[in-house]
């Protein structure tokens, strides 16, 4: 089930998924001056089973000026380049997909992809928040949001994060002081689709990753 809305916006913060649930789609978008080639895909789709998940399809971009020049297909992990992002650039440490069953890791970049990635999340997806450069995190609880299904409608939980304007950068989970335990979440309903175990696995997984801020847009 696709999440109807985007994750909540927190002033002076960005969010990122550490892993993507099966069913997540990523649009194949190209940067200005480039277009999707006809033999390239419309989207990538996270598929798999309990033991292995991966992204189906390839995104490919070509110059809008030329009709027959195709650009590099989705590279293999060892060919990954540093991601060009809107705000900051930071290398990403690959995560073993098997470390979180039923999830795909961040897809590697493709040449001339758009600056912002358009993901379509599914129910159960968790995203983590981080204050942007120049702002410091004040936590009341976990700096995360989960897409849940409640009474037939999807909604994102509210992350317990405030970013204050002090010149200090906070990190994604695992790179700062431990946050409140998942039991401490101010959630009243019992329809949560992400279990404590899921949270623990994702937090442990997040701890293995370097800071990586991608500005992501949703449609």
């Amino acid at each position: 089930e696709l999440c109807d809305d985007d994750p909540p916006e927190i002033p002076h913060a960005t969010f990122k998924a550490m892993a993507y649930k099966e069913g997540t789609m990523l649009n194949c978008e190209c940067k200005r001056g480039f277009r999707r080639i006809k033999s390239g895909s419309l989207y990538m789709l996270c598929t798999g089973n309990s033991s292995h998940s991966s992204w189906d399809n390839q995104c490919q971009c070509t110059s809008s000026a030329t009709r027959n020049t195709t650009k590099q297909v989705t590279p293999q992990p060892e060919e990954q380049k540093e991601r060009k992002t809107t705000e900051m650039q930071s290398p990403m440490q690959p995560v073993d997909q098997a470390s979180l069953p039923g999830h795909c890791r961040e897809p590697p970049p493709w040449e001339n992809e758009a600056t912002e990635r358009i993901y379509h999340f599914v129910v159960g997806q968790m995203v983590y928040y981080q204050c942007v450069q120049g702002y410091r995190a004040l936590h009341r609880g976990p700096a995360e949001s989960v897409c849940k299904m409640t009474h037939g409608k999807t909604r994102w939980t509210q992350p317990q994060l405030i970013c204050t304007g002090e010149m200090e950068t906070s990190q994604f989970p695992g790179e700062e002081k431990p946050q409140a335990s998942p039991e401490g979440r101010p959630e009243s309903e019992t329809s949560c689709l992400v279990t404590t175990t899921d949270f623990q696995i994702q937090t442990e997984m997040a701890a293995t990753m370097e800071t990586s801020i991608f500005t992501t847009e949703y449609q």
Epitope: E1, L2, D4, E22, G23, M25, N27, K38, S39, S41, L42, Y43, L45, T47, G48, N49, H52, S53, S54, D56, N57, Q58, V73, T74, H120, Q219
Partner: antibody, heavy 113, light 107 residues
Framework: DVQLVESGGGLVQPGGSRKLSCAAS????????MHWVRQAPEKGLEWVAY????????YYADRVRGRFTISRDNPKNTLFLEMTSLRSEDTAMYYC??????WGQGTLVTVST | DILMTQSPSSMSVSLGDTVTITCHAS??????IVWLQQKPGKSFKGLIY???NLEDGVPSRFSGSGSGADYSLTISSLESEDFADYYC?????????FGGGTKLEIK
């Protein structure tokens, strides 16, 4: 250019079986999920089945689940649809498709006595 | 399953006319929709993807719009080659589902 060519259609008796093939070229077949879609005579389109690039994930329409099997041979760039226990309502033109912009010409399956 | 309700099912129009075909999804599909064209006795051609993006090589008289659960395909200044069947398909979730189709006929 992407090319998809279906084959294997024909006249089948009710209760019989048939295996359709779709030969793909012009793209890296082994990295793309693939679909089978059908169109009954003078009717609209009906999605039949999907298989992920590495065959780890398959989805079927309720009407064919348990009777149809989608599979693929990546080294041979070929997609398959094995159909068993065929019924008259399975009569249709069967198309293979790759994320909706690229379709084959179709192969006609007629289930009749 | 997501139900795609396409309208009209058929329409008689004249060369040069502008026509709009709509598809309503039973739930939001976040622009995960393709518009297809099928000419008599032929296969399918993708015209619009992600709701609004024109496929390379498709004439600019075709355009797509919409968001949430409601989407439309507009063909301005109809040409003779545009008389065909048109379908929408959603790829937001499995099972993939199609609109019932619209037949464009010459008046």
């Amino acid at each position: 250019d992407v090319q998809l060519v279906e084959s294997g259609g024909g006249l089948v008796q009710p209760g019989g079986s048939r295996k359709l093939s779709c030969a793909a070229s012009g793209f890296t077949f082994s990295t793309f999920g693939m679909h089978w879609v059908r169109q009954a005579p003078e009717k609209g389109l009906e999605w039949v089945a999907y298989i992920s690039s590495g065959s780890s994930t398959v989805y079927y329409a309720d009407r064919v689940r348990g009777r149809f099997t989608i599979s693929r041979d990546n080294p041979k760039n070929t997609l398959f649809l094995e159909m068993t226990s065929l019924r008259s309502e399975d009569t249709a033109m069967y198309y293979c498709a790759r994320d909706w912009m690229n379709w084959g010409q179709g192969t006609l399956v007629t289930v009749s006595t | 399953d997501i139900l795609m309700t396409q309208s009209p099912s058929s329409m008689s129009v004249s060369l040069g006319d502008t026509v709009t075909i709509t598809c309503h999804a039973s739930q939001g599909i976040r622009s995960n929709i393709v518009w297809l064209q099928q000419k008599p006795g032929k296969s399918f051609k993708g015209l619009i993807y992600h709701g609004t993006n024109l496929e390379d090589g498709v004439p600019s008289r075709f355009s797509g719009s919409g968001s949430g659960a409601d989407y439309s395909l507009t063909i301005s200044s109809l040409e003779s080659e545009d008389f065909a069947d048109y379908y929408c398909v959603q790829y937001a979730q499995f099972p993939r589902t199609f609109g019932g189709g619209t037949k464009l006929e010459i008046k």
